[in-house]
């Protein structure tokens, strides 16, 4: 008989190399039976995982599994780091393995403006 516990299928030592300035979707595969659990994303800061507020998320349903998606539109250099999804199910908190994003800043160092120039780019 198949278990009806919620399971989060992020592989151990999962990682993604991505480019800043382009969109990216970070997926948390969620297996559940009846009621879809409440799932959240957090970002690791040392040993603490800080809950991500004000971030766009969505669900993608497939036949045997669902995905809770964290949207990066676009990826920023600050998004570099490790993330974890967690599910609340029958008063239990289930945490996934962490997944790491390695963000490459596509704007080369030579193209990077100085602090004084940085704000001036915002002029039409």
């Amino acid at each position: 008989k198949e278990s009806c516990d919620v399971q989060l299928y992020i592989k151990e030592q999962s990682e993604h190399s991505i480019l800043a300035g382009d969109p990216f979707e970070l997926e948390c595969p969620v297996k559940y039976c009846a009621n879809r659990p409440h799932v959240t994303w957090c970002k690791l800061n040392g040993t603490t995982c800080v809950k991500l507020e004000d971030r766009q998320t969505s669900w993608k349903e497939e036949k045997n599994i669902s995905f809770f998606i964290l949207h990066f539109e676009p990826v920023l250099p600050n998004d570099n780091g490790s993330y974890r999804c967690s599910a609340n199910f029958q008063s239990n908190l289930i945490e996934s393995h962490s997944t790491t994003l390695y963000v490459t800043d596509v704007k080369s160092a030579s193209e990077r403006p100085s602090k004084d120039e940085m704000a001036s780019r915002f002029w039409a």
């Epitope: 480019l19 800043a20 300035g21 382009d22 969109p23 507020e53 004000d54 971030r55 766009q56 949207h71 539109e73 676009p74 920023l76 250099p77 600050n78 596509v106 704007k107 193209e111 940085m118 780019r121 915002f122 002029w123 039409a124």
Partner: antibody, heavy 120, light 106 residues
Framework: QVQLKESGPGLVAPSQSLSITCTVS????????VHWVRQSPGKGLEWLGV???????SYNPAPMSRLSISKDNSKSQVFLKMNSLQTDDTAMYYC??????????????WGQGTSVTVSS | QIVLSQSPAILSASPGEKVTMTCRAS?????MHWYQQKPGSSPKPWIY???NLASGVPARFSGSGSGTSYSLTISRMEAEDAATYYC?????????FGGGTKLEIK
Amino acid sequence: QVQLKESGPGLVAPSQSLSITCTVSGFSLTTYGVHWVRQSPGKGLEWLGVMWPGGRTSYNPAPMSRLSISKDNSKSQVFLKMNSLQTDDTAMYYCVRGDYEYDYYAMDYWGQGTSVTVSS
Amino acid sequence: QIVLSQSPAILSASPGEKVTMTCRASSSVSYMHWYQQKPGSSPKPWIYATSNLASGVPARFSGSGSGTSYSLTISRMEAEDAATYYCHQWSSNPYTFGGGTKLEIK
């Protein structure tokens, strides 16, 4: 010097389609995203969608079914196509460059806009 | 979608007067951008990421806020500040703008 310039038909008949070209200079479409924003008296500023540097697109869900954004990196051009125009699509259409900093994203350089009137 | 409500819609201020306009979001956003637009021109970035002034923007302008409430303040109104100011969020698609605050000089 960063510049974006829109070119459009000006007048479009109802139910017809709209095609606008945005020609950019001073930056590469493989490094920066280009957005389409329109401004109408009735709806104010409305973000329509973006062509990301890697070639993916994101759209405003409301007009999404009528919208298509594409680009030609070699010609430094981004294209907006909108089908089934109605009178409330009458607006000034802007293409706008998007840029990221360490922890935020913003639209920085705006084109001068192209005025589109939907009328028979 | 996140709705941005700007108030007041029209604001009239005398030279030298302190001016504050607000932008309220229907859901929490990470930061807010502000654009200035004058008749016949494209919008110009004015304040980005809540409180950073764009280059050339006078120091009498400031921005603040967090969560669902943001504001733009002018410490001393000047004639050249007369324009429409729009807030804009880049937290959730569709990326929305406020309806604008039209600032007039008395």
